[in-house]
């Protein structure tokens, strides 16, 4: 079960980074990307 939770969490992280990249293309990128810990 813990492997599944880790996989889901990592998948969501990957999606979040992808979304961040797309939003940065619209909004303009300034600093290094970061993702908040939940």
């Amino acid at each position: 079960h813990s492997d599944g939770i880790f996989t889901d969490s990592y998948s969501r992280y990957r999606k979040q980074m992808a979304v961040k990249k797309y939003l940065a293309a619209v909004l303009g990128k300034r600093y290094k990307q970061r993702v908040k810990n939940k």
């Epitope: 961040k20 909004l27 300034r30 908040k36």
Partner: antibody, heavy 115, light 112 residues
Amino acid sequence: VEESGGRLVTPGTPLTLTCTVSGFSLNNYAMSWVRQAPGKGLEWIGIMGVNDITYYASWAKGRFTISKTSTTVDLKMTSLTTEDTATYFCTREIRDDGDSSDKLWGPGTLVTVSS
Amino acid sequence: AIKMTQTPSSVSAAVGGTVTINCQASEDIYTNLAWYQQKPGQPPNLLIYDASDLASGVPSRFSGSGDGTQFTLTISAVQCEDAATYYCQGVAWSSNTGYGSAFGGGTEVVVK
């Protein structure tokens, strides 16, 4: 950031609002349009990205068009109805991981659609 | 398209009390959420961005939390000048439609 062009128009009349900016380059910031009907909440219309690509709320597609020059961001509105009566705001967006001081709102311009 | 549901629509608080406003997104928006304060006749003023980052010049009694679809704005030690309408704004990215944004319906805060 200051909006202009709002006025009283009759239904069906097209209208273009202009957002004039100074002190920064539109090449570096995305700009959005937001509206607020009298006594109602805020409604996102659309955004002009730094990549010059525009995105719109689903209800605004086809009737609203955002364009820009070197110092202005325009909102062209067609087929206006009384439901479009609102104060229209132009806003400068925060850049990715940017400073909150990036976020600027104009004072708004009032559009009244009435017969 | 993204939809933001904000509750309650109105709340009353005593000076020194605490106010909690909730915002729910129709889809996972990660931390792409901002909170605004608006007073009559004025444009909105940014309070919180990226779900929990305090905007410059905003008193520390304002705080934001949340991630995904559930977000909260908390006003601690409420002051008279906090009487206003508060809005959340979410931003999403769709592979179909690209950039999308929406505001919550607003929460009127009345200070007694």
